[in-house]
């Protein structure tokens, strides 16, 4: 498919001249950021970004790659080096420590320097590192965490928790010996480490005692509370703040977000991770875009500004399943949340960053025709005279041998939301990838986001832009219209 | 392996504070660029950059990812959308048209708008688009092309040629019907379309008549001249310029580059593509770094400045073979050339860009320990109880079934320069990938390289920075010390 207008050199020359004009007009703002938003696409490597752009464009009846994601419109880009101190290819815990606390840690640890060792409780104390969210709170800002995973998951936990094991969601997940040594589960830390104004995502079951039925799935014992200590953490959290509200469904969320008496909001919409966007019950569960909007409505009331973490956390899960359909539709919803946030905030006073914690071994090749489905087949056949998809994985559960050979695939099979793209190596879960990821930046001090940087740089840019510790002497003019 | 100093948060905080300090000091130069250099890593997607960084670092006895490539030091980064007008995943011809001419074309065409059709000679005329190199020459600058492939290959050809078929290297490759219609082979266009001051790379056989023995392989008929028209294009080129010199080996190149009487230099060091760096005969063939240095010595004599295209063209070939060792060692030599060029030029007057034309379906996963070989095995076993490598391909010739199953692999096998990493789909040649690639920029107007851009933007930035057509009214101050 060749669009007629693109056959004319003028089309490209005009477009590039406009882009140059926009580039020339870019003026680094010398003001501080009142608000900080970090959008974290978990597992959203560059290949995921491009594939999602095409899919989002095609959903709007375009050919695809010529269209723009919301994040594509951010004026500044850097590359982020994601390795952890102990691994070339990291996990979401060590990376969260990097981009939220500004310090690299070890694989599967959270909020701790690399002096801490995975699963060794006694290496926790003294090695805690403090997140930018925590520092923002101390500076009088409102703070929030929004995610499509459990709110106790590795990425959001980087904003508030310190743990040698990212899997210690509730006390039931913490070995008795570690509990005795004083190591707290992540859910406990969520409500006790710091005052978080908005908490939205999944993870109900980790907040309630074992035997507590889940409100959405009351007959399903496996979805009920998991806690062994008998604590109702939601109740404890509500008791801390007079204007606190707990919600567990979309209707309640929308009501609470418009209620001026609500000062603190916790919304937990699933027992564990939230459902994939394509499986979401839109009457019961809010979308990531809706959660982001609700968070912004509450947080933006604070004249001192806010810090908000927004995670598209299940992009990663789709990839781990080798189900690109899930990963890419999650990426589109993530991008929709970015777009909505952009409409609700001003780049005059809000530094917005979009990045990934790491990538995935996910590729998009095979020379497909422009406008063809991102989930489709490559032109021609493979060496084994069978079709193959343009999307593939290096490793993962999509590896199958049928009668000692690679299975054939049709366009209708590969387009299914359940289809697992093939991989070179059979694994239960496809792995992360270690290549640099993009950082997109907009707003005050966004121009500092440049070149190739360590992932830790992200936290430092946020702290500096908002004159938070250790950059309180930031020497930046307050943003225009500050009310503080 | 956990470096002790990295266990201390101060290590990361200090490092980030330094990076922030450097970012704050970045001042966009308001001057024009006297010189333009574009370094093109063919097939050098972000996964290749990261893997090469680790390998280069480990060759210096470091753990790897914490080190810097020369390109990593460039202060500005953008992402480039590489699709061609007709394909989501492009080839090196259409992409060369984009980044060298500023207009997107169709798959496998070069220097033509998308109104031209692959292999249809009669769609050539009237659809030619003019490269930045050509415009630089018209503005009085010296110009050069350096590559590790044939100089008639798709990427370098984008600087000087217009062809509906990238494979028309010599007239022997052009169908008689197309020759009759007036379509010229790329080698002919190399010497006749424009005056190129420096031409260095492979591609001897396309310049000489059939039956002409190759000077390096005189007994090997397959390496000799291929031309059917009886023309000796080297002789014709030499006749055009009084100070022209033709060389075919390293010794002659080094002599010529230091000879002030040489104004034009053509060095063709292999009949076809140059050898991979790891196979290069260091007495006969120059490295990419040496060719780059030679080109800069000649070109920098011009007080009006120069345009130089430098291609690490065989990164791509290594990937097509699914031999990551070759791809990554080529990338390191490419980076070495960038480093050397940086030493020989000044960022006060030279805009240097580093980019890729496209990526490859190449991934780096599996959670390997820091410091472990990039060519090594992932920890643990796959589902089939066999080892697997951290580097893998989505498709390509590394797919093998042994007795109806995926072959096992040892660390020593995977570390071999000849090892082909496994892939999900068996193809004769691994394919390009369609995700965005990085653009690294340094020098005057480098700050314009920002955000997510069409690949065409690259050509326009170069043209604008040097006030070339269509940006002669660029309104930029001449660089300091201009002698024009």
């Amino acid at each position: 498919i060749i669009p007629v207008e693109e056959e004319n050199p003028d089309f490209w020359n005009r477009q590039a001249a406009e882009a140059l004009g926009a580039a020339k007009k870019l003026q680094p703002a010398q003001t501080a950021a009142k608000n900080l938003i970090i959008f974290l696409g978990d597992g959203m490597g560059v290949s995921t970004v491009t594939a999602a752009r095409i899919l989002k464009g095609q959903k709007k009846d375009k050919l695809g790659p010529e269209t723009f994601l919301a994040m594509d419109r951010f004026p500044y880009v850097a590359l982020s080096k994601t390795y952890s101190v102990d691994k070339h290819v990291p996990d979401s815990g060590a990376t969260a420590t990097a981009y939220l606390c500004g310090v690299k840690g070890n694989f599967q640890t959270i909020g701790l320097s690399a002096a801490a060792r995975f699963n060794q409780c006694n290496t926790t104390r003294g090695n805690e590192v403090i997140s930018v969210m925590n520092r923002a709170k101390k500076a009088g800002k409102s703070v929030g965490v929004v995610t499509t995973t459990r709110v106790q998951h590795a990425s959001p936990a980087g904003a508030y928790a310190h743990t040698v094991n990212r899997n210690w969601y509730s006390d039931a997940d913490v070995p008795a010996s570690a509990r005795q040594e004083g190591c707290q589960d992540i859910a406990t830390q969520l409500i006790s480490n710091m005052d978080i104004d908005v908490i939205l995502g999944g993870g109900r079951k980790y907040m309630f005692p074992m035997g507590t039925p889940d409100p959405e799935y009351p007959d399903d014992y496996s979805q009920g509370g998991t806690r062994l200590d008998g604590k109702n953490l939601v109740q404890e959290w509500l008791a801390k703040h007079q204007g606190a509200r707990y919600v567990w469904n979309r209707t309640e969320l929308l009501q609470a977000s418009l209620d001026p008496s609500v000062t603190h909001l916790m919304g937990l919409f699933e027992p564990g991770d939230m459902k994939y966007e394509i499986h979401r019950d839109s009457t019961l569960d809010p979308s990531l875009m809706e959660m982001t909007e609700a968070a912004l409505l509450l947080l933006s009331r604070n004249p001192r500004g806010f810090f908000l973490f927004v995670e598209g956390g299940r992009i990663d899960h789709g990839h781990h399943e080798s189900r690109a359909y899930r990963a890419l539709t999650e990426t589109i919803m993530f991008d929709d949340a970015i777009e909505r946030a952009g409409q609700l905030t001003s780049e005059e006073d809000t530094l917005s960053l979009v990045t990934a914690d790491h990538s995935h071994v996910f590729s998009f090749g095979g020379y497909p025709l422009r406008g063809s489905s991102i989930f489709g087949l490559a032109p021609g056949k493979a060496r084994d005279r069978k079709a193959y998809t343009v999307l593939l994985y290096g490793n993962g559960p999509g590896y199958v041998l049928k009668d000692g050979a690679r299975p054939d695939v049709t366009e209708s099979e590969s387009g299914s939301p359940e289809y697992r793209q093939q991989s070179a190596v059979p694994l239960d879960g496809e792995t992360h990838a270690g290549e640099d990821v993009a950082v997109f930046a907009r707003g005050p001090q966004a121009h500092l986001v440049h070149g190739v940087q360590e992932q830790t740089f992200i936290a430092h840019v946020m702290a500096f832009a908002a004159c938070l510790e250790p950059y309180t002497a930031c020497d930046l003019a307050p943003r225009a219209g500050t009310t503080d | 392996i956990i470096p002790v100093e990295e266990e201390n948060p101060d290590f990361w905080n200090r490092q980030a504070a330094e990076a922030l300090g450097a970012a704050k000091k970045l001042q966009p130069a308001q001057t024009a660029a006297k010189n333009l250099i574009i370094f093109l890593g063919d097939g050098m997607g972000v996964s290749t950059v990261t893997a090469a960084r680790i390998l280069k670092g480990q060759k210096k006895d470091k753990l790897g990812p914490e080190t810097f490539l020369a390109m990593d030091r460039f202060p500005y980064v953008a992402l480039s959308k590489t699709y061609s007008v007709d394909k989501h995943v492009p080839d090196s011809g259409a992409t060369a048209t984009a980044y060298l001419c500023g207009v997107k074309g169709n798959f496998q065409t070069i220097g033509l708008s998308a109104a031209a059709r692959f292999n249809q000679c009669n769609t050539t005329r009237g659809n030619e688009v003019i490269s930045v190199m050509n415009r630089a020459k018209k503005a009085g600058k010296s110009v050069g092309v350096v590559t590790t492939t044939r100089v008639q290959h798709a990427s370098p050809a984008g600087a000087y040629a217009h062809t509906v078929n990238r494979n028309w290297y010599s007239d022997a490759d052009v169908p008689a019907s197309a020759r009759q219609e007036g379509c010229q082979d790329i080698a002919t266009q190399l010497i006749s379309n424009m005056d190129i001051d420096v031409i260095l790379g492979g591609g001897r056989k396309y310049m000489f008549p059939m039956g002409t023995p190759d000077p390096e392989y005189p007994d090997d008929y397959s390496q000799g001249g291929t031309r059917l028209d009886g023309k000796n294009l080297v002789q014709e080129w030499l006749a055009k310029h009084q100070g022209a010199r033709y060389v075919w080996n390293r010794t002659e190149l080094l002599q010529a580059s230091l000879d002030p009487s040489v104004t034009h230099l053509m060095g063709l060091f292999e009949p076809g593509d140059m050898k991979y760096e790891i196979h290069r005969d260091s007495t006969l063939d120059p490295s990419l770094m040496e060719m780059t240095e030679a080109a800069l010595l000649l070109l920098s004599r011009n007080p009006r400045g120069f345009f130089l295209f430098v291609e690490g063209g065989r990164i791509d070939h290594g990937h097509h073979e699914s031999r990551a060792y070759r791809a990554l060692t080529e990338t390191i030599m490419f980076d070495d050339a960038i480093e050397r060029a940086g030493q020989l030029t000044s960022e006060e007057d030279t805009l240097s860009l580093v980019t890729a034309d496209h990526s490859h379906v190449f991934s780096f996963g599996g959670y390997p320990l820091r410091g472990s070989s990039i060519f090594g095995l992932a920890p643990g076993k796959a589902r089939d109880r066999k080892a697997y490598t951290v580097l893998l391909y989505g498709n390509g010739p590394g797919y093998v079934l042994k007795d109806g199953a995926r072959p096992d692999v040892t660390e020593s096998e995977s570390g071999s320069p000849e090892y082909r990493q496994q892939s999900a789909v068996p193809l004769d040649g691994e394919t390009h990938a369609g995700e965005d690639v990085a653009v690294f920029a340094r020098g005057p107007q480098a700050h314009l390289v920002h955000g997510v851009q069409e690949q065409t933007f690259i050509a326009h930035v170069m043209a604008f920075a040097a006030c070339l057509e269509p940006y002669t009214a660029c309104d930029l101050a001449p660089r300091a010390g201009t002698t024009d």
Partner: antibody, heavy 123, light 106 residues
Framework: EVQLVESGGGLVQPGRSLRLSCTAS????????MSWFRQAPGKGLEWLAL??????????EYSASVKGRFTISRDNSKSIAYLQMNSLKTEDTAVYYC??????????????WGQGTLVTVSS | DTQMTQSPSSLSASVGDRVTITCKAS??????IAWFQYKTGKAPKLFIH???TLQPGVPSRFSGSGSGRDYTLTISSLQPEDIATYYC????????FGQGTKLEIK
């Protein structure tokens, strides 16, 4: 002109060792892969060992049949490749050839061979 | 390791005959196959590499073809001086020879 000359062959008793040498000339020795092959009486050609070039760290590879007994090495200052053969067996009796690889079409083609040296393992 | 199965092991043909020798690899060898002529008491001589590229000085009656796992050496018109043993060699992954084909004149 590329030349490869093998030496060091001869009669040796089973269980003993022998070192073969391959003296190279006419090319930049450090840039090339060197290999050893053999042909036993009445048998086919067999690859034994390979040593790579400077650019690839002079890494080595062996066929399963000789791994652990034979060692390939090189003295780059003298442009000599060696094959150290230990624990020799009667079935190691063969003509041993030294070869240099040339990279054509990016494959390691065995374009250059020495004339061979005879090794006889017998008691 | 890649195995090479060469056939036939011996072949008797008349001068002027078209002779074909085949080699099958245990896996795809990406056209990295060479053919050697071996005469007793001499070093093996490279005749063809990369499936079909003739070495300098090799008569044009010799040709090679194939792809994937299957490869062929053809002598279009057998000459007396062609009497020798021919070996295929894969060099995609290290080196492996075929068992050889002894060519004789009837």
């Amino acid at each position: 002109e590329v030349q490869l000359v093998e030496s060091g062959g001869g009669l040796v008793q089973p269980g003993r060792s022998l070192r073969l040498s391959c003296t190279a000339s006419g090319f930049t020795f450090t840039d090339y892969y060197m290999s050893w092959f053999r042909q036993a009486p009445g048998k086919g050609l067999e690859w034994l060992a390979l040593i790579r070039n400077k650019a690839t760290g002079y890494t080595t590879e062996y066929s399963a049949s000789v791994k652990g007994r034979f060692t390939i090495s090189r003295d780059n200052s003298k442009s000599i490749a060696y094959l150290q053969m230990n624990s020799l067996k009667t079935e190691d009796t063969a003509v041993y050839y030294c070869t240099r690889a040339s990279f054509y079409y990016d494959g390691k083609v065995l374009a250059y061979w020495g004339q061979g040296t005879l090794v006889t393992v017998s008691s | 390791d890649t195995q090479m199965t060469q056939s036939p092991s011996s072949l008797s043909a008349s001068v002027g005959d078209r002779v074909t020798i085949t080699c099958k690899a245990s896996q795809d060898i990406n056209k990295y196959i060479a053919w050697f002529q071996y005469k007793t008491g001499k070093a093996p001589k490279l005749f063809i590499h990369y499936t079909s590229t003739l070495q300098p000085g090799v008569p044009s009656r010799f040709s090679g073809s194939g792809s994937g796992r299957d490869y062929t050496l053809t002598i279009s018109s057998l000459q007396p001086e062609d009497i020798a043993t021919y070996y295929c060699l894969q060099y995609d992954n290290l080196y492996t020879f075929g068992q050889g084909t002894k060519l004789e004149i009837k």
